[in-house]
């Protein structure tokens, strides 16, 4: 089968399938949709197709990550003549079709957003009646999930030569700036973005040498808010006790 896309500001949502001149395959998705973690987001997707008056069975599909090969997060099927698209798959029950595929609308609602939902999504429609054809948005819509900082781990670890170091890891989008404060410290901004694959929202800051006993506080901040957590270092008989 053959397919293309268009990048246009024209509103094709209400274009009739049987309008003249004949429609060609196209899908309209915005490059990006932004929403905050915990909220819901709508991923718009409308399409046109060349099969006039098509009323046969159809399937609407959304994938994440990659077109064609990416995992499906939503799938529904509508029987011949039906405007009801029965959900067959909704990952974690958080995906719901808002649009009506019979009216060329595959728009999807995603509930209870998490930072892990920050990826590209691709809509697809399949016709399976007298006409066998399918079309997928190859460029997709990027769902950009924002989140206030959250410190996911703070700890004190032994270092060589009976020393100690502190680690603070936080998540957020935009990635938060981390700062340490504590005894005999100013503010240390020794934050480095975690290099681990798939952890792009995690930031880690290390205090390489804790020279004084007391309370060490890690503060994470971005444009949406701030968060802080503390560890306590007490050295006695060469051992350390740390609590948050």
């Amino acid at each position: 089968f053959v397919r293309t896309k268009i990048d246009t500001t024209e509103n094709l949502l209400n274009t009739e399938v049987h309008s003249s001149p004949a429609q060609r395959w196209s899908m309209q998705v915005p490059p990006e949709v932004s929403a905050e973690a915990g909220d819901a987001a709508v991923l718009p997707c409308t399409f046109t197709h060349p099969h006039r008056h098509y009323d046969g069975p159809l399937t609407a599909i959304w994938r994440a990550g990659e077109p064609y090969a990416g995992p499906q997060v939503f799938r529904c099927a509508a029987a011949r003549g039906s405007e009801l698209c029965q959900t067959a798959l909704s990952l974690h029950g958080r995906f719901r079709l808002l649009g009506n595929p019979r009216r060329n609308d595959l728009s999807l609602r995603v509930e209870r957003l998490a930072l892990a939902d920050d990826r590209r999504y691709f809509c697809r429609v399949e016709f399976a009646g007298d006409v066998h054809d399918r079309y997928e948005s190859r460029h997709g819509v990027r769902l950009h999930v924002t989140a206030a900082p959250r410190i996911v781990n703070i700890s004190v670890l032994p270092s060589p030569a009976h020393a100690f170091r502190a680690l603070c890891t936080a998540e957020g989008e935009p990635p938060p700036a981390l700062a340490w404060s504590g005894p005999a410290l100013g503010n240390s901004l020794a934050a480095v973005r975690s290099p681990r694959e798939g952890h792009g929202h995690l930031v880690t800051a290390e205090l390489p040498a804790l020279t004084h006993d007391g309370r060490y506080t890690c503060t994470a901040a971005n444009s949406l808010g701030r968060s802080e957590a503390s560890v306590y270092l007490f050295r006695f008989h060469g051992a350390s006790g740390a609590s948050t």
Epitope: T4, R24, W25, G65, R120, E136, R138
Partner: antibody
């Protein structure tokens, strides 16, 4: 400004290998599918291969399938084409191009010449 | 696989209208794009989605697609428009170009 610059072309013997590079600048490389298109001397354009944003989806023309491998390094803003088992009919100027959201090629490099000859 | 067919050559007098056709069954359902290529240079996109013009392309370039034939029209052709023109389309896994048309401005 938006720019693509190919390199790595040259003279190679039949059966040999060559790796082409395409350095991208002036745009967010990881937001675009990329492609290689070639043009034999005095002939028309022939699409060679596509690669998706992350590199995990690739497509090839039948004429190069199994011999050529497209890849990308988004951290270096660079597209690659590894060409193995080269044949005389692979002689061409190889262009890298950016694919716009309408499945058209909106930015092209200047091309690099690959000559396969003994 | 899809195939796109173009005439090898088209001639036009300066100031006149040049029309270059591209035919193929795929064009009944899918968009065409057009590329201009001058000797020794890389191709340049002049039309996409049948009739859309990228920024920087003169208004004298226009496109249409009817039935199984896409047409590139150059109104008021100028000497600098002399070039090879290629149509293109896409089938989900491969992109195909027509054989190219050499436009000669007499």
């Amino acid at each position: 400004q938006v720019q693509l610059v190919e390199s790595g072309g040259g003279l190679v013997q039949p059966g040999g290998s060559l790796r082409l590079s395409c350095a991208a600048s002036g745009f967010t490389f990881s937001n675009y599918w990329m492609t290689w298109v070639r043009q034999a001397p005095g002939k028309g354009l022939e699409w060679v291969s596509f690669i998706s944003y992350s590199g995990s989806t690739t497509y090839y023309a039948d004429s190069v399938k199994g011999r050529f491998t497209i890849s990308r390094d988004n951290s270096k803003n660079t597209l690659y084409l590894q060409m193995n088992s080269l044949r005389a009919e692979d002689t061409a100027v190889y262009y890298c191009a950016r694919e716009g959201t309408s499945s058209m090629f909106d930015v092209w490099g200047q091309g690099t010449l690959v000559t396969v000859s003994s | 696989d899809i195939e796109l067919t173009q005439p090898p050559s088209v001639s036009v007098a300066p100031g006149q209208t040049a029309r270059i056709s591209c035919s193929g069954d795929a064009l009944r359902s899918y968009y065409a794009s057009w590329y201009q290529q001058k000797p020794g240079q890389a191709p340049v996109l002049v039309i996409y989605d049948d009739n859309k013009r990228p920024s920087g392309i003169p208004e004298r370039f226009s496109g249409s697609n009817s039935g199984n034939t896409a047409t590139l029209t150059i109104s008021g052709t100028q000497a600098e428009d002399e070039a090879d023109y290629y149509c293109g389309s896409y089938d989900g896994t491969v992109h195909v170009f027509g054989g190219g048309t050499k436009l000669t401005v007499l």
